[in-house]
């Protein structure tokens, strides 16, 4: 197993609709054809998997149907979008990239993106 550099933004603010997007870029040392991208969340001394997708270079990322993540790939960049976020989901979201094929296996872990989620205030009742 070999190490690989992964870059991601330090901070992202989720939209009022609970959507956050960020780019995960990895420095591929070779010509990988199969890549696995995993989004992890670190909070309260625990790391949990948010979502994961394996894709062939040049093809779209495919997350499970019930995943809260969507994404697109372009070269060594993955554009990730996480939906359905609420204030309690605020935390450090880490991009983990694995070059699965061909060998050798490479593993890269980003420094994490702190995603802040603010629940929208309910609209006051209107007379109109």
């Amino acid at each position: 197993c070999k190490a690989m550099h992964v870059a991601q933004p330090a901070v992202v603010l989720a939209s009022s609709r609970g959507i956050a997007s960020f780019v995960c870029e990895y420095a591929s040392p070779g010509k990988a054809t199969e890549v696995r991208v995993t989004v992890l969340r670190q909070a309260d001394s625990q790391v949990t998997e948010v979502c994961a997708a394996t894709y062939m270079m040049g093809n779209e990322l495919t997350f499970l149907d019930d995943s809260i993540c969507t994404g697109t790939s372009s070269g060594n960049q993955v554009n990730l979008t996480i939906q359905g976020l609420r204030a309690m989901d605020t935390g450090l979201y880490i991009c983990k990239v694995e070059l699965m094929y061909p060998p050798p296996y490479y593993l890269g872990i980003g420094n994490g993106t702190q995603i802040y989620v603010i629940d929208p205030e309910p609209c006051p009742d209107s007379d109109f």
């Epitope: 197993c1 190490a3 992890l40 670190q42 001394s45 790391v47 994490g112």
Partner: nanobody
Framework: EVQLVESGGGLVQPGGSLRLSCAAS????????IGWFRQAPGKEREEVSC????????NYADSVKGRFTISRDNSKNTVILQMNSLRAEDTAVYYC???????????????????WGQGTQVTVSS
């Protein structure tokens, strides 16, 4: 809250083997840096081995190199310390320790640890 629990200690003859296990209750050890320390009667506590959060880096004290092996079993949420060719001087209470570092340090062992288990006694004697 995560708690660490050691198991696998016991009495073994010189040259024998033991397999210590460090498990987490109340959470997982995924990506935690885990260390094994030991303390013999009348001696200072010493770090025996550690494994990084990714499992790619392992360190060993000179006194156990080539005899002890640390590994992660993420499917069982445990960290194993396999101890072979045990000697009388390995007799001690063995403690599992852990810390969840920032992701930038997941490939390294921690310099200090937040959590400590209660310890398990290892006695090497004929």
């Amino acid at each position: 809250e995560v708690q660490l629990v050691e198991s696998g200690g016991g009495l073994v003859q010189p040259g024998g083997s033991l397999r210590l296990s460090c498990a987490a209750s109340g959470g997982t050890l995924d990506y935690w840096s885990i260390g094994w320390f030991r303390q013999a009667p009348g001696k200072e506590r010493e770090e025996v081995s550690c494994i990084s959060g990714t499992g790619l880096r392992t360190n060993y004290a000179d006194s156990v190199k080539g005899r002890f092996t640390i590994s992660r079993d993420n499917s069982k949420n445990t960290v194993i310390l396999q101890m072979n060719s045990l000697r009388a001087e390995d007799t001690a209470v063995y403690y599992c320790t852990g810390k969840l570092l920032h992701p930038s340090l997941w490939s390294a062992c921690a310099n200090e640890y937040d959590l400590w288990g209660q310890g398990t006694q290892v006695t090497v004697s004929s």
